[in-house]
């Protein structure tokens, strides 16, 4: 039995730690009944062969953060017993090819972030009992076909962060039981069909921020247990028809920061288990009718940061569970007055930042469990009678940042907003844009001394042509100094009165979920 | 009448920071969205960033995103462009610019003179 | 989205009519504007929304086009008019610039 290294503590004897920068060589002598050993943060660059061999009853090391770069062929001998083995964040380049051959039982070996170039085609070849291999963050440029083949244990592999700019087809013929692959942050431009054939339990698949431009038709229709798929910041410029068809488990898929310009009908589905679809940061234009229609669990539908210019009346149908559709940062002129009429369960819709000229009367009116509407920053000069008022549950509704006409026209939109205020939050209230006599003052406090709906005469210096020589059509003409009188049957009707909402993102979508 | 006057440009390291201002006047200046446009020398006109009227929204070029800051203060007429890490592209006469309405649209009507940003070591 | 212009330089006397193309390399609706700009002063607004007359701007300028193809025309050049034009589209973020078409006096 051998004491504690002076460098180290242990605790109960068995587990040992070594840390801080001032140990520059493995401690010695390490107690013999050690069962786990961390040496982490040091100075300690090299491993030399001995310095294992009296801890064989050691189960875990953790060698990690240390500035680790040469480890000499048998410095793991006489760990039979291993099971956890971690090198992670340390500075090897290369790994002896016998390396492991005396740990043949280890069940996880991380080897995240060195600086690996290579991996030998027999180096893993004697752990048919490995779980988890890390290798994320080296610079491993290509993967030699049969480096896996005898992992036919492996439940979960990372290789992102590498660089590697293709992929054997064979490469992962023998990982049936596999479930969680991990190929992000690489450059891969292309995946051979069948490299995942022979994964039918897989569960994750992380292809996100490589550089792929085009998918093949069947490049998933074996993964029929894939859960989570992640093709988000690649290339993809079209989605195959039938692409996502034989994934009938899977429940988030991220396609946002590519390049699609379309969507094509049915090209989701039918995915009845998708609950979130992240479709942001592309080039979509249009949305066909039953765009989504196989999707009828989905929760969370973010199109955002697209250019979408036209939108389907159809294009939701089947969408009956969503609660949050993020449509905003477009190029929405207008909205037809059926596109939501499917949507029974909406909380959350986000408009901002679009060009919404004007809303039809009808488009919530099949929504009416609304929580927030958000039109800030839009082309608005007015909304129809009555839009919001069967939205009994309506938390915040933002409104500010449109060109609003304060003419007769919009009193029945003012008088609904001072008995709602309380729902436009406190950060900012809408405010008129024209006439200039009105322009700059509240929509909610203004005086009810509205100009009427008459062309205007000549305005102030400060007024350009483009927002305010817009006038509506002279058929109610009111002189400007008429006082308007207030009919009592106006469509605005009180809603339920509600506490303000103080904290914005109470009802709000997140910033990640909004896109 | 409509006035802009932009100020805070000069000489910087690379690495180095900028504020600039652009004093407004002569309109509702809450109601406008405003922009900074700039110009290289001797090359064309670049869109730098817009913010609308309540200051709720604002859009960036890709080359300024995360260093750059647009913003305003509404009482005090002003908009500000904050400019960290900068680079020799940086380069350029900067203009605050008056869009025609109170959401983030592309269209200018009114100018400031400029106000010239030099990065150079 | 990038914006092309052409021609890069044109010369034209003053009573000609001139013809500037821009062409997005994607679809953009109508969400363009055109700008002038002389030596050493600010750009000013001539078009809006491709087709709309900037109020104060001679009736001379127009511009047409829709979806990819743009076009700014001076139907009868005037000495004033000699600078360099500019179009802009606001449809998607990053909003973009052409590279510019410098009208010069013919020699």
């Known amino acids: 039995y051998y004491g504690c290294p002076s460098e180290c503590t242990c605790s109960r004897a068995s587990q040992v730690e070594c840390t801080g920068a001032q140990i520059v060589a493995m401690p010695s002598p390490l107690p013999w009944n050690a069962m786990s050993l961390q040496i982490l943060n040091t100075h300690i660059t090299e491993l030399p062969e001995d310095k294992f061999l009296n801890i064989s009853a050691l189960i875990a090391l953790k060698m990690e953060k240390n500035e680790l770069a040469n480890i000499m062929p048998g410095a793991f001998r006489n760990l039979g017993s291993l099971r956890h083995l971690s090198l992670a964040n340390n500075k090897l380049k290369n790994l002896p090819v016998r390396l492991f051959q005396d740990v043949n039982n280890l069940e996880t070996l991380l080897l995240s972030n060195n600086q690996l170039v290579q991996i030998q085609p027999a180096q893993f070849s004697q752990f048919s009992n490995l779980k988890e291999l890390q290798l994320y963050g080296n610079n491993l440029e290509y993967i030699p076909e049969g480096v896996f083949d005898h992992l036919v244990g492996l439940t979960k592999l990372n290789l992102g962060n590498n660089g590697f700019t293709h992929l054997s087809p064979r490469v992962f013929q023998h990982l049936g039981n596999l479930q969680v692959l991990r190929l992000y942050e690489n450059r891969l431009s292309d995946i051979p069909m069948g490299t995942f054939d022979a994964l039918g339990n897989l569960q994750e698949l992380a292809l996100q921020e490589n550089q792929i431009g085009t998918l093949s038709p069947g490049l998933f229709h074996n993964n029929r247990n894939l859960q989570r798929l992640y093709l988000s910041n690649n290339h993809i410029s079209h989605l195959p028809p039938g692409i996502f068809m034989q994934l009938p488990h899977l429940n988030k898929l991220t396609l946002f920061g590519n390049s699609l310009k379309e969507l094509s009908p049915g090209v989701f589905g039918p995915m009845p288990n998708l609950r979130e679809l992240w479709l942001y940061n592309n080039h979509i234009t249009s949305l066909p009718d039953n765009a989504f229609s196989h999707l009828n669990q989905l929760q969370v539908l973010i199109l955002s940061h697209n250019q979408l210019s036209y939108i389907s009346p159809g294009a939701f149908n089947g969408l009956t569970n969503l609660r949050e559709l993020s449509l905003h940062t477009n190029a929405l002129q207008d909205l037809d007055g059926n596109v939501f009429r499917s949507l029974a369960n909406l909380r959350n819709v986000s408009l901002q930042n679009n060009r919404l000229r004007q809303l039809p009367g009808s488009i919530f009116a099949n929504v009416n469990g609304l929580m927030t509407i958000q039109l800030q920053n839009n082309n608005l000069e007015n909304l129809p009678l009555g839009i919001f008022d069967h939205l009994g549950n309506l938390c915040e509704l933002r409104l500010y940042d449109n060109p609003w006409r304060c003419d007769s026209n919009i009193l029945p939109l003012h008088d609904w907003l001072i008995l709602n205020r309380a729902r436009l939050g406190t950060d900012t209230l809408p405010v008129c844009s024209s006439p200039a006599s009105v322009r700059g003052q509240s929509l909610v406090i203004i005086n009810v001394n509205f100009p009427g709906p008459s062309v205007q005469g000549p305005e102030t210096p400060e007024v350009s042509s483009y927002p305010d020589t817009s006038s509506y059509p002279d058929s109610t003409s009111i002189s400007s100094t008429t006082e308007i009188t207030r009919s009592t049957d106006d469509d605005y009707t009180d809603l339920n009165t509600i506490e303000p909402i103080d904290d914005r993102n109470t009802w709000g979508m997140t910033d990640a979920q909004s896109g | 009448q409509v006035q802009l006057l932009e100020s805070g440009g000069g000489l910087v390291q690379p690495g180095g920071s900028l504020r600039l201002s652009c004093a407004a006047s002569?309109?509702?200046?809450?109601?406008?969205?405003m922009s900074w446009v700039r110009q290289a020398p001797g090359k064309g006109l670049d869109w730098v960033s817009v913010?609308?009227?309540?200051?709720?929204?604002?859009f960036y070029t890709d080359s300024v995103k995360g260093r750059f800051t647009i913003s305003r203060d509404n009482s005090e007429n002003t908009l500000y462009l904050e400019m960290n890490s900068l680079r020799a592209e940086d380069t350029a006469v900067y203009f605050c610019?008056?869009?025609?309405?109170?959401?983030?649209?592309?269209?200018?009507?009114?100018w400031g003179q400029g106000t010239l940003v030099t990065v150079s070591s | 989205i990038v914006l092309t212009q052409s021609p890069s330089s044109l010369s034209a006397s003053v009573g000609d009519r001139v013809t500037i193309t821009c062409r997005t390399s994607q679809v953009i609706r109508n969400d363009l504007g055109w700008y002038q700009q002389k030596p050493g002063k600010a750009p000013k607004l001539l078009i809006y929304?491709?087709?709309s007359l900037q109020s104060g701007v001679p009736s001379r300028f127009s511009g047409s086009g829709s979806g990819t193809d743009f076009t700014l025309t001076i139907s009868s050049l005037q000495p004033e008019d000699f600078a360099t034009y500019y179009c802009?589209?606001?449809?998607?973020?990053?909003?973009?610039f052409g590279q510019g078409t410098k009208v010069a006096i013919k020699r």
């Open positions: 929304d491709a087709s």
């Open positions: 610019a008056k869009a025609v309405t109170v959401n983030t649209r592309g269209f200018f009507d009114y």
């Open positions: 913010i609308s009227g309540t200051g709720g929204s604002t």
């Open positions: 002569g309109f509702t200046f809450s109601t406008f969205a």
């Open positions: 802009l589209q606001d449809n998607n973020y990053p909003w973009t």
